[in-house]
């Protein structure tokens, strides 16, 4: 599966779109910083077979899609940018799903690491809880946007390692 060729450009575009999404000065939001406990170990990629790494990436993108496609998100961000964002995420999900299908039967290990998937879900639950507690304030969304950009950057590192494993 030749994932990164089709995927890394879309990942870069996603980051660029997120960078443009800011509505308020982040300098006014410093005190809203929060430790979401990004599951770094799930993106180190050392303990994974390729299919499992792909499933973790897929879960992260799916959860990001879910997070940004809520009513509260739509009320916060520019509609045109959100649509572009959805398109890129959808493209990445399709790429990863196609890759996962190609990996079926290639490796003896399971396609999915259930513990890793749950860890990613819990991470997004913490983000959603934070937004709820902050009543989806503009600053809370700014902090979340910064966190998701960081997690996408870190996941790009995993994709790069996957490409080198090809």
């Amino acid at each position: 599966c030749d994932l990164p060729q089709t995927h890394s450009l879309s990942n870069r575009r996603t980051l660029m779109i997120m960078a443009q999404m800011g509505r308020i000065s982040p300098f006014s939001c410093l005190k809203d910083r929060h430790d979401f406990g990004f599951p770094q170990e799930e993106f180190d990629g050392n303990q994974f077979q390729k299919a499992q790494a792909i499933s973790v990436l897929h879960e992260m993108i799916q959860q990001t899609f879910n997070l940004f496609s809520t009513k509260d998100s739509s009320a916060t961000w520019d509609e045109t940018l959100l649509d572009k964002f959805y398109t890129e995420l959808y493209q990445q999900l399709n790429d990863l799903e196609a890759c996962m299908m190609q990996e079926v039967g290639v490796e003896d290990t399971p396609l999915m690491n259930v513990d890793s998937i749950l860890t990613v879900r819990k991470y997004f639950q913490r983000i959603t809880l934070y937004l709820t507690e902050k009543k989806y304030s503009p600053c809370a969304w700014e902090v979340v946007r910064a966190e998701i950009m960081r997690s996408f950057s870190l996941s790009a590192n995993l994709q790069e390692r996957l490409r080198r494993k090809e």
Partner: antibody, heavy 121, light 107 residues
Framework: EVQLVQSGAEVKKPGESLKISCKGS????????IGWVRQMPGKGLEWMGI????????AYSPSFQGQVTISADKSISTAYLQWSSLKASDTAMYYC??????????????WGQGTLVTVSS | DIQMTQSPSSLSASVGDRVTITCRAS??????LNWYQQKPGKAPKLLIY???SLQSGVPSRFSGSGSGTDFTLTISSLQPEDFATYYC?????????FGQGTKVEIK
Amino acid sequence: EVQLVQSGAEVKKPGESLKISCKGSGYSFTSYWIGWVRQMPGKGLEWMGIIDPSDSDTAYSPSFQGQVTISADKSISTAYLQWSSLKASDTAMYYCARHPGLNWAPDFDYWGQGTLVTVSS
Amino acid sequence: DIQMTQSPSSLSASVGDRVTITCRASQSIDRALNWYQQKPGKAPKLLIYFASSLQSGVPSRFSGSGSGTDFTLTISSLQPEDFATYYCQQSFDFPLTFGQGTKVEIK
């Protein structure tokens, strides 16, 4: 390897203008803010201001607002600190340092080596 | 602005001593407090961030504690290379502010 490399020492006369630089490498320059810190001879650290290189948004300490201008050129991963009219009291060591922005990560984890600015008639 | 007050402003200690430096904020800053070490002619170096997290590569003899307004930097067993000036800095809100520094000298 993450590095912030600052421009060399400057000797200027009062009333002259100056622009010093801080070039980032080894990381995504637009993913971190760049802060500037002053240290006058034999004194402590004073935060001057900060810039988000992704969109050049800035914030200044009230003590330095209107006294200096912070800017950045993301195409060459460089931040700048400038004065339009230097005073003898601007004599100091100036440091740049990177800041993680709104991310929960270490503040000012990498620093430039410092630029010594001497203003004397 | 949030004022940061360090104490003592200087102290003399011997190698092997346990050293404690305190930092007080003029208002609650949660745990948004960093500690830096600076040696003469050098740039500051981050030791502790978010009050108690040890920065990568920093020896474990350095530790930080506190929240709200009162914070502490502890060096469990002072080493020759630890003689320097230490600064606290709040990262809770702009403008960011530093303490005035604590100089740790050889007794």
